[in-house]
Amino acid sequence: YHGCPSECTCSRASQVECTGARIVAVPTPLPWNAMSLQILNTHITELNESPFLNISALIALRIEKNELSRITPGAFRNLGSLRYLSLANNKLQVLPIGLFQGLDSLESLLLSSNQLLQIQPAHFSQCSNLKELQLHGNHLEYIPDGAFDHLVGLTKLNLGKNSLTHISPRVFQHLGNLQVLRLYENRLTDIPMGTFDGLVNLQELALQQNQIGLLSPGLFHNNHNLQRLYLSNNHISQLPPSVFMQLPQLNRLTLFGNSLKELSPGIFGPMPNLRELWLYDNHISSLPDNVFSNLRQLQVLILSRNQISFISPGAFNGLTELRELSLHTNALQDLDGNVFRMLANLQNISLQNNRLRQLPGNIFANVNGLMAIQLQNNQLENLPLGIFDHLGKLCELRLYDNPWRCDSDILPLRNWLLLNQPRLGTDTVPVCFSPANVRGQSLIIINVNVAVPSVHVPEVPSYPETPWYPDTPSYPDTTSVSSTTELTSPVEDYTDLTTIQVTDDRSVWGMTQAQSG
């Protein structure tokens, strides 16, 4: 194979791979016809002048996971055919000016997971054909104006996991072909108006895990092709009314983990491709009419772990396709009887961990397909007669941890629960809170006459006249019901959101994500 170094393996296809801790310098002689060279997991600490001079046909060069901390400016001389260069996972702090000079064919440059402190316009001024630039996982504190001005063909730029505190509004202005811009996990506090104006082809913008407090009203107005917008885990306290107005292609939007206090009507509009919206872990206190009215295709709306105390009757107008609504862990005391009236396709509603004292009898009147209702840990003492009568598909109902008042008025509910026990689950059953002599006893088996002997108990029809029979075909097999433990992606319930569940340098949409790329 035209001379293969002993520390390397060389294939007939001109692929050379050199790995191992015993390698401390670029092996020689390298086969003159090499097209792909990988130098991985070695103890090489520096690249001197022209170590690849005799392999000018090289197309791909990966020098990854080494001890590399110093590169001579002429290290890549004579590699005019090189299309792919990775220096990822090394210990580079400085890039010499002119390092990439002459790499006229270079399309992908990976500099991620090093210790780079700065980049300068001169670093990439020769890389006019570059399409992908990975700079994530370094120590960059700022990007100077002009740094990317010559990279007019760039389609993917990753600046995530650095220490950027601010971005100049001009730094991306010439990147009209950019499709993916990742700025996650930096220290950005605000993004100047106009920063993204030149990015007319942008499809993904990742700004999550910064310290952004305010969004300029027209920040995304030129990004009509944006499909994925990640804004979670910032300090955003308000959304300007028009900020999302011109994003018709959006299909992923994350806003959880911010400081949002209110949402204005029509703020999310029109987004016909958005199916899931995560707004948990904010400070939202109320929901006005028509706040989600443009989200006609929304299937999942997560509003849990806020401070919602008031929901306007028309707050959920337009959400005709909604299947899951999570309102748990808020400050709700009362709900209007019509608040869920428009949610004809709702299957799962989470209302646990609120302060609900009572429910209107018609609260679920139009929501005939409900399969799961979470009402545990509220302040409910009783429920209106017939509240669940029409819910033929209901197979999960959680009522425990409420202060049920077991007087004669509880009899209709008790009788219904008796007939529908399987729907309550086996983990925790509702128990009486008052009167004192029955406190702690199961609501289902309590003898109401014993509980309040002085009260005459009239004959009352049992709750609905539709007992739950496990073998009845009209009821769904309980195994087909989605769990309502509310771990909606991204996981938002009973989880420390700072926890990272890592699997091979990436993680699931379980918590905050730890993924390079």
């Epitope: 992908s108 992908e132 389609t155 993917k156 990753n158 995530g160 499709q179 993916v180 990742r182 996650y184 082809n201 499809q203 993904e204 990742a206 999550q208 092709n225 499909q227 994925r228 990640y230 979670s232 299909n251 994350t254 491709n273 199916r275 899931e276 299937q299 999942v300 299947r323 899951e324 299957q347 799962n348 019901v481 989605s482 769990s483 309502t484 433990t485 509310e486 771990l487 909606t488 992606s489 991204p490 996981v491 569940q501 990436r506 993680s507 699931v508 949409w509 379980g510 994500q513 730890a514 993924q515 390079s516 790329g517």
Partner: antibody, heavy 122, light 107 residues
């Protein structure tokens, strides 16, 4: 270890119904979106349906919309595909797969089951 | 729906050869593309995600590139176990369509 095991396949007549199950183990099932993908004999892969980790969001291919229903039971670490009004063209190996995605560019079916064969024939 | 096309549909090569498979999307999908390998009678296995990122545990002879509408999977030096079928798949929007596949055969 991380594993997905499908079951419920078999021979069914056109117009009939079948329910596929997928048992997951070795990972926190409720953290992940899940999907069904099928492959007709000597053909390519066809995405069928996906479901969000809570079960709230559901997506179908046009070819099965209105006939197939995806669901999950996180308490049982199980994914299901209810297939009604089956047609000859639904004959395929059906795979369940973990749909792993995050906000840093990861999007993939990273774990697959071994597949279960569904044959629709009179 | 986004239509994915792959070329060639099949190719013949020898052990040690370098091969490139192309995948084209009917509209821009940024970098939301994955590549899979499928051996006969087995389930597919993920090779590449985000168009160019190598899945953990996958040999470094596999690499991906591209964004927008044009993508490539390159196997820098074919080994005997690489003579199987390869699929691309877009995750940009539902439905998550696959390419028709490329079968790599021994010459």
């Amino acid at each position: 270890q991380v594993q997905l095991v499908e079951s419920g396949g078999g021979l069914v007549k056109p117009g009939g119904s079948l329910r596929l199950s997928c048992a997951a183990s070795g990972f926190t099932f409720s953290d992940y979106y899940m999907s069904w993908i099928r492959q007709a004999p000597r053909k390519g892969l066809e995405w069928v349906s996906s479901i969000s980790n809570s079960g709230g969001a559901i997506y179908y291919a046009d070819s099965v919309k209105g006939r197939f229903s995806i669901s999950r039971d996180n308490a049982k670490n199980s994914l299901y595909l209810q297939m009604n009004s089956l047609r000859a063209e639904d004959t395929a190996v059906y795979y369940c797969a973990r749909y792993n995605w995050n906000d840093r560019g990861y999007d993939a079916f990273d774990i697959w089951g071994q597949g279960t064969m569904v044959t629709v024939s009179s | 729906d986004i239509v994915m096309t792959q070329s060639p549909s099949s190719l013949s090569a020898s052990v040690g050869d370098r091969v490139t498979i192309t995948c084209r999307a009917s509209q821009g999908i940024s970098s939301a593309l994955a590549w899979y390998q499928q051996k006969p009678g087995k389930a597919p296995k993920i090779l590449i995600y985000d168009a160019s990122s190598l899945e953990s545990g996958v040999p470094s002879r596999f690499s991906g590139s591209g964004s927008g509408t044009d993508f490539t999977l390159t196997i820098s030096s074919l080994l005997p176990e690489d003579f199987v079928t390869y699929y691309c798949q877009q995750f940009n929007s539902y439905p998550h369509t696959f390419g028709p596949g490329t079968k790599v055969e021994i010459k």
